[in-house]
Interface confidence: medium
Amino acid sequence: TLNSVLNSNAIKNLPPPLGGAAGHPGSAVSAAPGILYPGGNKYQTIDNYQPYPCAEDEECGTDEYCASPTRGGDAGVQICLACRKRRKRCMRHAMCCPGNYCKNGICVSSDQNHFRGEIEETITESFGNDHSTLDGYSRRTTLSSKMYHTKGQEGSVCLRSSDCASGLCCARHFWSKICKPVLKEGQVCTKHRRKGSHGLEIFQRCYCGEGLSCRIQKDHHQASNSSRLHTCQRH
């Protein structure tokens, strides 16, 4: 089977070759900026820092949204732009940085129910089921959309952050999306240095809690890019 670690909305709407051709299970994701692709058992990134073209917000990094680079510009040319911080103007939730949402045209601090999950709708299960069909290709799985009568506890499956109890968010964890804790000071966080790379993670972390931001750990400056740890630190 194709052991690609390709994930959800970030690839579901892309045409081949980015989305992978259905008839070619061996084809890796092509060399798009920051996209992870299978090279044997190593998942590599392509260091290309051009503006990342996009069609929707989900194709951009956590701290980005998809829009035309110029005001009133050609809607057909969209790239990933830096998210808007608190009290900045916005037109939709995705424009606001994690931990904020768009209210009355302004980015404001969010509660759990307004957290912009990175993958809110469906999950692409790209490992392929070990009891899958004969073609052995990766297949698509959608989580059941049952209503949650009680808020999900840590580790329980979820579709969106509003399914989770207070202090938790809904994030990808290997095979599914589960409720995970919002990160505290000193805890490891994920900083998406390469545009678009978050969409292909098989793991996600929640965002850092109030008053914290995800920054490189001071004693890891000498480490190689791939091994650098980021932690939630006070602003």
């Epitope: 999900g152 506890q153 840590e154 580790g155 329980s156 290997f174 589960i178 805890q187 972390r205 791939s226």
Partner: antibody, heavy 116, light 111 residues
């Protein structure tokens, strides 16, 4: 509190079959992925299989693929492991574990001995 | 067929600090910032002590801490106590067919 209780272990001959069960209580079983992990006598832990909360996805370690089948009955809060074509190297204590953020709760295990 | 490498044994005196290492490759431990540690007393089931590199589940003493650099993760136990004597296993994920990998285990002896 979360409780997982395995049963069904025992002595079986090589080539034989066995079905393990894991009764879950103290949490919403249908909302969690579940795994089986085994430990050969005096050895380390080895992941065996995992099943999604709604049974739509299953994964197996290469060492058991094609011989073991994981399943669950959410109405009975029970996880199963059907083990066929058993080999001597399958001898181990089999644990069921809740796979939340990693294996956050474990049962006490049931011993499976494959010997002639 | 153990994917992650741990020392077979470590020891320390009560009150001391000890560190257990866990080494993998870029295809498993080094590729993901997701490492867990489990404690197992003889005849008992394993217990999750650390997840996501350095997060402690509720109820786990803050004497236990985790870290990671490159392809190596570490579990540090400070203020060693007699009840810490147990086997410790690291666990990570892998990009190959074996999707969950454990270390071979480290026996901690409190002198």
């Amino acid at each position: 509190q979360v409780q997982l209780v395995e049963s069904g272990g025992g002595l079986v001959q090589p080539g034989g079959s066995l079905r393990l069960s894991c009764a879950a209580s103290g949490f919403t079983f249908s909302s969690y992925w579940m795994s089986w992990v085994r430990q050969a006598p005096g050895k380390g832990l080895e992941w065996v299989s995992v099943i999604s909360s709604d049974s739509s996805s299953t994964y197996y370690a290469d060492s058991v693929k094609g011989r073991f089948t994981i399943s669950r009955d959410n109405s009975k809060n029970t996880l199963y492991l059907q083990m066929n074509s058993l080999r001597a190297e399958d001898t181990a204590v089999y644990y069921c574990a809740r796979h939340g953020i990693d294996f956050d709760h474990w049962g006490q295990g049931t011993l499976v001995t494959v010997s002639s | 067929d153990i994917a992650l490498t741990q020392p077979a044994s470590v020891s320390g005196s009560p009150g001391q600090s000890i560190t257990i290492s866990c080494t993998g490759t870029s295809s498993d431990l080094g590729g993901y910032n997701y490492v867990s540690w489990y404690q197992q007393h003889p005849g008992k089931a394993p217990k999750l002590m650390i997840y996501d590199v350095n997060n402690r589940p509720s109820g786990v003493s803050n004497r236990f801490s985790g870290s990671k650099s490159g392809n190596t993760a570490s579990l540090t136990i400070s203020g060693l106590q007699a009840e810490d004597e147990a086997d410790y296993y690291c666990q990570s994920y892998a990009s190959g067919n074996t999707k969950v990998v454990f270390g071979g285990g480290t026996k901690l002896t409190v002198l």
